[in-house]
Interface confidence: medium
């Protein structure tokens, strides 16, 4: 049999002020996938139980948004959310699963060049 | 204001299943998670498991095929089968216990004594 | 399976005391952390919930700090009606665990 491993969109990238999914498959059919974390840094963002439903941390709630399915959506992105995200896989009787998704916020475009002109 | 009460008979044979109610009132269930917690006399606390809002439920490892936990309107039940003098204790119910603000209120807690 | 360890099991303190009680869970549980106290014949009460924040009409000489693995129950100043047991409570995992609750710490009379 296959041993199971996470897998994850690795390193993405998004506009400040946009929206990024973070998301993290396992792949594998043989283990009960009880609860799914989501964490940035040391920071839990975000707990998604298989059966009684998600649980947004409440420094988050009006930044994250549930789904699609165990992913997790992210808006109203700022350069300060670059970064690493974890998911977390409480599974039995495997144990604990974890993947990695690198963020990159990049700053607006959009830059204000001014040209002078010499007045002879 | 938020009440819980069990009931249930205080003595149960062994081999027998023991059945308790918790009746609650000042809340809805169909918002609340609620968990029973057991006190074997001079021991500490020990969880039996959690009914969720949508009715879903999660057992201790020890007590999986021996207690089932279901909910009514304004009742959870608790049964647990096959008991022995080791299940006698004091039986407790407890709004909340799953990610939210701790389990708050409790029940006044019954004691069930399993002898023959 | 999360382990939930307490330390000491039992401690003996005057009135007045700084008292404080430490819980170790084996992995990582956030803030998703309660503490109770029991007195004998009671039904336990909640004092702290979310690791530090402090249960409606509990007196603030109670404290709780930390988070992750590593949990603190502080009293500031040991009261007589303090004296009774404490247990400390993982809300993180309901899945596949044995027991949600430490094994206790009984605090009593020097």
């Known amino acids: 049999t296959m041993a199971s491993m996470i897998v994850t969109t690795g390193n993405i990238s998004a506009e400040e002020g946009g929206s990024a999914i973070l998301q993290c498959h396992l792949s594998s059919t043989t283990t009960e996938v009880t609860q799914v974390n989501w964490e940035q840094q040391d920071r839990l963002l975000a707990v998604r139980h298989v059966d009684l439903g998600w649980h947004i941390s409440p420094a988050f709630k009006e930044r994250v948004v549930p789904g699609p399915s165990l992913s997790l959506t992210l808006l109203a992105l700022t350069v300060n959310d670059t970064g690493e995200y974890f998911c977390t896989y409480h599974t039995y009787p495997d144990g604990i699963y974890k993947g990695r998704i690198f963020l990159e916020v990049r700053g607006s475009s959009v830059a204000e060049h001014s040209i002078g002109f010499q007045i002879p | 204001q938020v009440q819980l009460q069990e009931s249930g008979p205080g003595l149960v044979k062994p081999s027998e299943t023991l059945s308790l109610t918790c009746t609650v009132s000042?809340?809805?269930?169909?918002?609340?998670?609620m968990s029973w917690i057991r006190q074997p006399p001079g021991k500490g606390l020990e969880w039996i498991g959690i009914i969720g809002s949508n009715g879903n439920t999660y057992y201790a490892n020890w007590a999986k095929g021996r207690v089932t936990i279901s909910k009514s309107s304004n009742q959870v039940s608790l049964k647990l089968s096959s008991v022995t003098a080791a299940d006698t204790a004091v039986y407790y119910c407890a709004r909340g216990g799953y990610r939210t603000s701790g389990m708050d209120p409790w029940g006044q807690g019954t004691l069930v004594t399993v002898s023959s | 399976d999360i382990q939930m360890t307490q330390s000491p099991s039992s401690l003996s303190a005057s009135v007045g005391d700084r008292v404080t009680i430490t819980c170790q869970a084996s992995q990582n549980i956030y803030s998703d952390l309660a503490w109770y106290q029991q007195k004998p014949g009671k039904a336990p009460k909640l004092l702290i919930y979310?690791?530090?924040t402090l249960a409606s009409g509990v007196p603030s000489r109670f404290s709780g700090s930390g988070s992750g693995t590593d949990f603190t129950l502080t009293i500031s100043s040991l009261q007589p009606e303090d004296f009774a047991t404490y247990y400390c409570?993982?809300?993180?995992?309901?899945?596949?665990?044995?027991?949600?609750f430490g094994q206790g710490t009984k605090v009593e009379i020097k």
């Open positions: 409570q993982q809300e993180h995992l309901v899945a596949w665990i044995y027991n949600v």
């Open positions: 979310r690791a530090s």
């Open positions: 000042g809340f809805s269930l169909s918002s609340s998670y």
